[in-house]
C-alpha cells in the first residue's frame, strides 16, 4: 500500500511527508527510517527532529523544506541503487500509540545514457539494443524521476486524505492537526 517514488542513480530523491503544527513553533517530533514503520519508533533512523530542531541526521539525508511549518519531506542526495526500498516517515503525535506512520517506496533506476551525436556509431556498437527502444518510452528530457508514480484516481485519493486527515486538538502529546501528503 506504499506510494511509490522514483529517482535515477545520481539524482536527488524526494520523499514527501507533511503535518500542520497546532500552532506556530509547536512542533511534533518526526523520525525517518529505512525500512517499513515498526510498531514503535523508527528503525534504522536516518534523520530525526524534536520539538525545536533537526537533532540527528546522517550524510546525504536532509530536510529541504521548512520543517518548522510541518514540511518534513526527506531529500536523499546523489542516490545509488542501494537506496531503493521502503522509508518510514513517523510523525510522533503526543499520546498513546497515536503516531501517524507513512511507508514510502523509493525505486532507483539506473541513469539513462544519452548518446552524443558524434559518438553514435561507437555507442550503438557497445549498446546495440539501446537505440532501438528510443522513442517508445518517456521523452529523454523528462526528469520527473522523484515524483510519485500514481494515477489520477490515486491523486484524487491523496487529495481527499489531505482534506480529511485532521486530528482533534487534544490527546497524545498536545495533538497537532495532521495533514499528510
Amino acid at each position: 500500500s506504499e506510494v511509490e517514488y522514483r529517482a535515477e542513480v545520481g539524482q536527488n530523491a524526494y520523499l514527501p511527508c507533511f503535518y500542520t503544527p497546532a500552532a506556530p513553533g509547536n512542533l511534533v517530533p518526526v523520525c525517518w527510517g529505512k525500512g517499513a514503520c515498526p510498531v514503535f519508533e523508527c528503525g534504522n533512523v536516518v534523520l530525526r527532529t524534536d520539538e525545536r530542531d533537526v537533532n540527528y541526521w546522517t550524510s546525504r539525508y536532509w530536510l529541504n523544506g521548512d520543517f518548522r511549518k510541518g514540511d518534513v519531506s526527506l531529500t536523499i542526495e546523489n542516490v545509488t541503487l542501494a537506496d531503493s526500498g521502503i522509508y518510514c516517515c513517523r510523525i510522533q503525535i503526543p499520546g498513546i500509540m497515536n503516531d501517524e506512520k507513512f511507508n514510502l517506496k523509493l525505486v532507483i533506476k539506473p541513469a539513462k545514457v544519452t548518446p552524443a551525436p558524434t559518438r553514435q556509431r561507437d555507442f550503438t556498437a557497445a549498446f546495440p539494443r539501446m537505440l532501438t527502444t528510443r522513442g517508445h518510452g518517456p521523452a529523454e528530457t523528462q526528469t520527473l524521476g522523484s515524483l510519485p508514480d500514481i494515477n489520477l484516481t490515486q491523486i484524487s485519493t491523496l487529495a481527499n486524505e489531505l482534506r480529511d486527515s485532521r486530528l482533534a486538538n487534544d490527546l497524545r502529546d498536545s495533538g497537532a492537526t495532521i495533514r499528510i501528503g
Epitope: S1, A36, C37, V39, G95, I96, M97, N98, D99, E100, K101, F102, N103, E161, D164, S165, R166, L167, A168, L171, R172, I178, I180
Partner: antibody, heavy 113, light 107 residues
Framework: EVQLVESGGGLVQPGGSLRLSCAAS????????INWVRQAPGKGLVWIGW????????KYTPSLKDQATLSTDLAKNTAYLQMNSLRAEDTAVYFC??????WGQGTLVTVSS | DIQMTQSPSSLSASVGDRVTITCKAS??????LGWFQQKPGKAPKTLIY???RLVDGVPSRFSGSGSGQDYTFTISSLQPEDIATYYC?????????FGQGTKLEIK
C-alpha cells in the same frame, strides 16, 4: 474530528461467530494504529489486539490468538474484529480505538443460549 | 507477558482529598505507561501518557510519576466529577496489558 463507530454486536449462541466493525473517520485511516479492547460486565479492560491498516500488520494477546482475527477494508475506512468459537466468558463490550486515545462507544456482545 | 499490578482495587475519599493509585510492572517498561479514567457506560479516556505527561485539556490536578517498574497516579484535590474507575496500561511491548483497575468513590 476523529470518530470511531463500532457495530455488529448482539446475542450469539455459544460456539458461534461474530464480526464487529469499526468505522473510522476524521483522519487518514491507513496511517494510524487501531487497537481492540474488551470489557466483561463489571470487569476490567483487556487488550485484544492491534492492526496497522497501512500494511495489515497485526498483533494479538496470546489467550485470544486462535479466536480473534483483525482485518481492515481500506476502501471503507473500516476495521474488523472476527471472533470465533464464542463462549459465555466472551460476553463483553468491545471497543476499537485509534491508537489508544480516541475510542469508539463500544458494542455489546452477549454469548448465551 | 508483562503483568501490571494496580492498587488499591477500590478506595473511598472525600472531596478535596489527595488520592494516590500505584501500578507496578513485572519488568522495566521504560516509562511507557498510561493512565485512563472510565465512567460507567462510557469508553475509557486517556489522562496521562509516558508516565508523567498530561494529555491536553485534562485538569492539572491529575498527575503521574515513576520510572522502571513503579508508577504512581495522583489526584491532588478530589472533585465530585472524578468519581470513576482508573486503569494503568503498559505499552512498552506486546501484548499490551492493563492494571486491574481502581474504583474511586466519594465518602
Amino acid at each position: 474530528e476523529v470518530q470511531l463507530v463500532e457495530s455488529g454486536g448482539g446475542l450469539v449462541q455459544p460456539g458461534g461467530s461474530l464480526r464487529l466493525s469499526c468505522a473510522a473517520s476524521g483522519y487518514t485511516f491507513t496511517s494510524s494504529d487501531i487497537n481492540w479492547v474488551r470489557q466483561a460486565p463489571g470487569k476490567g479492560l483487556v487488550w485484544i489486539g492491534w492492526i496497522f491498516p497501512g500494511d495489515g500488520s497485526t498483533k494479538y494477546t496470546p489467550s485470544l490468538k486462535d479466536q480473534a482475527t483483525l482485518s481492515t477494508d481500506l476502501a471503507k475506512n473500516t476495521a474488523y474484529l472476527q471472533m470465533n468459537s464464542l463462549r459465555a466468558e466472551d460476553t463483553a463490550v468491545y471497543f476499537c480505538a485509534r491508537g489508544l486515545d480516541y475510542w469508539g462507544q463500544g458494542t455489546l456482545v452477549t454469548v448465551s443460549s | 507477558d508483562i503483568q501490571m499490578t494496580q492498587s488499591p482495587s477500590s478506595l473511598s475519599a472525600s472531596v478535596g482529598d489527595r488520592v494516590t493509585i500505584t501500578c507496578k510492572a513485572s519488568q522495566d517498561i521504560n516509562s511507557y505507561l498510561g493512565w485512563f479514567q472510565q465512567k460507567p457506560g462510557k469508553a475509557p479516556k486517556t489522562l496521562i501518557y509516558r508516565a508523567d505527561r498530561l494529555v491536553d485539556g485534562v485538569p492539572s490536578r491529575f498527575s503521574g510519576s515513576g520510572s522502571g517498574q513503579d508508577y504512581t497516579f495522583t489526584i491532588s484535590s478530589l472533585q465530585p466529577e472524578d468519581i470513576a474507575t482508573y486503569y494503568c496500561l503498559q505499552y512498552d511491548e506486546f501484548p499490551l496489558t492493563f492494571g486491574q483497575g481502581t474504583k474511586l468513590e466519594i465518602k
